[in-house]
């Protein structure tokens, strides 16, 4: 356990401040699997990469949290980063 969490954190820490801001914005509207709720907008604003990783894992658990993070990265044009994240979680 924890590999997916570490991979999410690695990816988010590699984002610039502007990209992290955009990530949070896209996270608010990204299509979700049925049965999952959305992280409240207010909670996201002040979060750094570490806080956001913890929130993603607590809200979506590790496996889906990593998949969702990868999808948001793809929506941002960061396909390579998304691929690295998914490769790290499937090792």
């Amino acid at each position: 356990m924890g590999r997916a969490r570490d991979a999410i954190l690695d990816a988010l820490e590699n984002l610039t401040a502007e990209e992290l801001k955009k990530f949070k914005l896209k996270l608010l509207s990204v299509p979700l699997r049925e049965g999952y709720g959305r992280i409240p907008r207010g909670a996201l604003a002040a979060m750094d990469a570490l806080d956001l990783t913890d929130k993603l894992v607590s809200f979506y658990l590790e496996t889906y949290g990593a998949e969702l993070t990868a999808n948001v990265l793809r929506d941002m044009g960061l396909q390579e980063m998304a691929g690295q994240l998914q490769a790290a979680t499937h090792q």
């Epitope: 299509p31 044009g77 390579e80």
Partner: antibody, heavy 114, light 107 residues
């Protein structure tokens, strides 16, 4: 409707280079289409931070750059041959999710001929 | 690289017919598939993104479906203005790739 502005035609000699421009924003893609053929993705560039991605097939001949002050993306195509005669489109990804190319320029027709 | 295979290569049809265009990805691309329409001497236009989301202003006779590796574009009742080339493309991984296209022609 966003309009991506591209010059219409370029005539260049074999072995020469051409620099294509596109007034755009966000992620700007460059796509090649030979007459009667499908679409080939050359690469893309993020106008806000200059981040680039290339199709390895085109990495040696295409260089993507940006001029932030004029919101213009460029692709320089070098060492051109007749195989590079094609229409070159720029396209933007503005839809928030799934990264499609939702706005396309009218394309620049490049003819490589001596 | 992810290979997108489109079939059929071309279709001859009559106005009002229902048309199904197919696109197969060489590996799982989730829902990261778009469909583009291209008329002669024009640039491509986005029809469908995220496999099933109709782009702004696209008539509801165009429907996208599928996920993972198999995708379909359906035109429920083809109109004369729909005669064009249709390209599918994936944005799941770099390099972004397109199918070779399907040409819709009048019978």
């Amino acid at each position: 409707q966003v309009q991506l502005q591209q010059p219409g035609t370029e005539l260049v000699k074999p072995g020469a280079s051409v620099k294509l421009s596109c007034r755009a924003s966000g992620w700007t893609h460059w796509v090649k289409q030979r007459p009667g053929q499908g679409l080939e993705w050359i690469g893309n560039i993020n106008l806000s931070n200059g981040r680039t991605n290339y199709n390895e097939k085109f990495r040696a001949m295409a260089t993507l750059t940006v001029d932030k002050s004029s919101s213009t993306a460029y692709t320089q195509l070098s060492s051109l041959t007749s195989e590079d005669s094609a229409v070159y489109y720029c396209a933007n990804s503005m839809v928030p999710h799934f990264f499609p190319m939702d706005y396309w320029g009218q394309g620049t027709s490049v003819t490589v001929s001596s | 690289n992810i290979v997108m295979t489109q079939y059929p290569k071309s279709m001859s049809l009559s106005i009002g017919e229902r048309v199904t265009l197919r696109c197969k990805a060489s590996e799982n691309v989730g829902s990261y598939v778009s469909w583009y329409q291209q008329k002669p001497e024009q640039s491509p236009k986005l029809l469908i993104y995220g496999a099933s989301n109709r782009y702004t202003g696209v008539p509801d006779r165009f429907t996208g479906s599928g996920s993972a590796t198999d995708f379909i574009l359906t035109i429920t009742s083809v109109q004369a203005e729909d005669l064009a080339d249709y390209h599918c493309g994936q944005s799941y991984n770099y390099p972004l790739t397109f199918g070779a296209g399907t040409k819709l022609e009048l019978k």
